[in-house]
């Protein structure tokens, strides 16, 4: 498939099985877990990556205040249902027939229910706030250098068009990266901010999804930027629907 290497691997997704059985003997790569063909010239969707991960053997003040509707992924890993394009299906259920609705990044946005639960549409996550705390350094990073380096990272490594990196905020030791992408802004083939954020999250955790590349080596003017904590907030185009019981818990 596109950009699968001569040695038949997928540079943008190591959780694939590749073989030269595409048209004309071209290399074709399929995601583990789902068996879906993936485009190796771009990032693989988070849904297919989560599915692959679940199928893999188990091993060991200028700052933004997240809105009251911001979601954090507290539920952790699950084996998702993906549609034919690799996107999350709006309704997800587990093996015990417990169901819930998710947004476009696969984060639960309703209370859990049973099989009668309806999720009418996949609600788009249009604003992602990545909140990082870096390890102590001799001094604060220069804000404009940090801004430029993080924008370069999202453009070059995660293939995200620069206009989707809305802002980089910094108050030592907290860094916030704001990604924004409305439906009207996303061209066909554009990397989704949810997928870019997921690749970044895995990189930060030292679990790079890229094939054969070294892990993420983030440096600002030669000074290593080492992250010790990450929190990601997701804002949907339509606010989530949780019961008051959860909100007061």
């Amino acid at each position: 498939h596109t950009a699968a290497q001569d040695n038949c691997t997928c540079p943008t997704n190591k959780m694939t099985v590749c073989s030269p059985d595409g048209p004309g003997g071209r290399c074709q790569c399929r995601a583990l877990g789902s068996g879906m063909a993936v485009d190796c010239s771009t990032l693989t969707s988070k849904c297919l990556l989560l599915k692959a991960r679940m199928s893999a053997p188990k091993n060991a003040r200028t700052l933004v205040r997240p809105s009251e509707h911001a979601l954090v992924d507290n539920d952790g890993l699950y084996d998702p249902d993906c549609d034919p394009e690799g996107r999350f299906k709006a309704r997800q259920c587990n093996q015990t027939s417990v169901c819930w609705c998710v947004n476009s990044v696969g984060v639960r946005r309703t209370d859990k229910g049973d099989l009668s639960l309806r999720c009418d549409e996949l609600v788009r996550t249009h604003h992602i706030l990545i909140d990082l705390r870096h390890r102590p350094t001799a001094g604060a990073f220069n804000h404009s250098d940090l801004d430029a380096e993080l924008r370069r990272l999202f453009r070059e490594r995660y293939r995200l068009h620069p206009k989707f990196v809305a802002a980089v905020h910094y108050e030592q030791p907290t860094i916030q990266i704001e990604l924004r992408q409305n439906t009207s802004q996303k061209a066909a083939g554009d990397v989704d901010i949810g997928d870019a954020a997921y690749y970044f999250e895995r990189d930060i955790k030292g679990e790079s999804l890229f094939q054969g590349r070294g892990g993420l080596d983030l440096r600002v003017r030669g000074e290593p930027l080492q992250v010790e904590r990450t929190l990601i907030y997701y804002l949907d185009e339509i606010p989530p629907k949780f019961s008051m019981k959860r909100l007061t818990a």
Epitope: T42, H127, R159, H161, E178, R180, N182, S184, Q185, A187
Partner: antibody
Framework: EVQLQQSGPELVKPGASVKMSCKAS????????MNWVKQSHGKSLEWIGY????????GYNQKFKDKATLTVDKSSSTAYMELRSLTSDDSAVYYC???????????WGQGTSVTVSS | DVVMTQTPLSLPVSLGDQASISCRSS???????????LHWFLQKPGQSPKLLIY???NRFSGVPDRFSGSGSGTDFTLKINRVEAEDLGIYFC????????FGGGTKLEIK
């Protein structure tokens, strides 16, 4: 001096494909997104898509997703656009245009005229 | 897609007069980063479009200061003070806040 030199005019038959080129000079080719724009005779402009030469990432106008394929050759600082299954509606002038940091198309090629006729 | 509507379609002017072209978008062009990615181009007969103004009001290099852009949200204006013969042609507005689109064009011609 920034320059975008496009390939010459094309006369092609319906159903055929055409591949045009846009050679960049005067700037670091891999640092800028390259856009392609269609202008039908006496009409306005339509954005087709962009490509980022450094890694080949693309974005397309949904309307042209199945019509156009954008590629680059970094070694020659050249961007390419292939148009397939041509019909008379594809007869137009096609421009490549560099995108600046304000996301505006600041330098344009001279255009490649495509005429689809049997 | 975001629709860009330009008025007038044709603008006859006398040399030395001021010309004003309007561009209206079907959605706000304010980006999540606070900027507004609305641009103006001039296309002379037989030539490719040339960038005049980017992000509403910034003149591109080499563009004379008789060209000025203004506006916000969904309503934008290009003004040309003291029109010269070399200014004649078709003016297009364009937005890149959303998937890029162009206005239909305004033909500036001699009265």
């Amino acid at each position: 001096e920034v320059q975008l030199q496009q390939s010459g005019p094309e006369l092609v038959k319906p159903g055929a494909s055409v591949k045009m080129s846009c050679k960049a000079s005067g700037f670091t080719f891999t640092d800028y997104y390259m856009n392609w724009v269609k202008q039908s005779h006496g009409k306005s402009l339509e954005w087709i898509g962009y490509i980022y030469p450094n890694h080949g990432g693309t974005g397309y106008n949904q309307k042209f997703k199945d019509k156009a394929t954008l590629t680059v050759d970094k070694s020659s600082s050249t961007a390419y656009m292939e148009l397939r299954s041509l019909t008379s509606d594809d007869s137009a002038v096609y421009y490549c245009a560099r995108e600046n940091y304000g996301y505006a198309m600041d330098y344009w090629g001279q255009g490649t005229s495509v005429t689809v006729s049997s | 897609d975001v629709v860009m509507t330009q008025t007038p379609l044709s603008l006859p002017v006398s040399l030395g007069d001021q010309a004003s072209i309007s561009c209206r978008s079907s959605q706000s062009l304010v980006h999540g980063d606070g900027n507004t990615y609305l641009h103006w181009f001039l296309q002379k007969p037989g030539q490719s479009p040339k960038l005049l103004i980017y992000t509403v009001s910034n003149r591109f290099s080499g563009v004379p200061d008789r060209f000025s852009g203004s506006g916000s949200g969904t309503d934008f204006t290009l003004k040309i003070n003291r029109v010269e013969a070399e200014d004649l042609g078709i003016y297009f507005c364009s937005q890149t806040t959303h998937v890029p689109t162009f206005g239909g064009g305004t033909k500036l011609e001699i009265k």
